[in-house]
């Protein structure tokens, strides 16, 4: 029997320095393009190889970005959020929410050679 899947939610402040092609990640979401049902928040869809975010190492695909330089990202159109990132300056402070998947409940022992392992 599988355990229940829960999420551990943490927040972190990440400071990035803009590179030649931006901050090194893509975003989805917004009031006009909900990425998560009933949530118009802005999410990281891709971390670009060798970009500023990848080199920093803390931002992850699937993270929710709560604010940029202290400016809340709630209830923004997708393009308005994009424009905030484009115009955020050289040194950018991001408040992000990580969701770490954790498994609760009974987890059966898997023997060696178990095909599900």
């Amino acid at each position: 029997m599988n355990g229940r899947v829960d999420y551990l939610v943490t927040e972190e402040e990440i400071n990035l320095t803009r590179g030649p092609s931006g901050l090194g990640f893509n975003i989805v979401g917004g009031t006009d393009q909900q990425y998560v049902s009933n949530d118009s928040g802005i999410y990281v869809s891709r971390i670009k190889e060798n970009g500023a975010a990848a080199l920093d190492g803390r931002l992850q695909e699937g993270d929710k970005i709560l604010s940029v330089n202290g400016q809340d990202l709630k209830n923004l159109l997708h393009q308005d959020a994009v424009d905030l990132f484009r115009n955020a300056g050289y040194a950018v402070s991001l408040r992000v929410q990580h969701r770490l998947q954790v498994q609760n409940g009974p987890i059966g022992h898997r023997g060696e050679g178990d095909p599900s392992g």
Partner: nanobody
């Protein structure tokens, strides 16, 4: 240094085909939402077709069923296969990328993209 260079345009008869290419340098193409845009003389620039970093695609109604966008990640090149060309497809065609948006529809509708090519002329006559 990010650079996009288009090629493949030309003069073609109505009903004919062309394949446009957009070679990227200075960045990895499949990390970006990127697309094809066109501007005819005296008209506003319009998004023709765009593709997200994860491969979702968007086509303007005027080209659906005739144009196909694709990406070769090995060659780091974006393509636009254009079939059944019409005189109204005559325009200067550009490729452009967004550094942030990964929503292909938003990219194609945006007038605020981050990297642009110089364009290649397509004339259908």
């Amino acid at each position: 240094h990010v650079q996009l260079v288009e090629s493949g345009g030309g003069l073609v008869q109505p009903g004919g085909s062309l394949r446009l290419s957009c070679a990227a340098s200075g960045f990895t193409l499949d990390d970006y939402a990127i697309g094809w845009f066109r501007q005819a003389p005296g008209k506003e620039r319009e998004g023709v077709s765009c593709i997200s970093s994860h491969g979702s695609t968007y086509y303007a109604d005027s080209v659906k069923g005739r144009f196909t966008i694709s990406r070769d990640n090995v060659k780091n090149t974006l393509y636009l296969q254009m079939n059944s060309l019409k005189p109204e497809d005559t325009a200067l065609y550009y490729c452009a990328a967004s550094y942030y948006s990964d929503y292909e529809v938003a990219v194609c509708r945006s007038d605020a993209l981050d990297a642009w090519g110089q364009g290649t002329q397509v004339t259908v006559s």
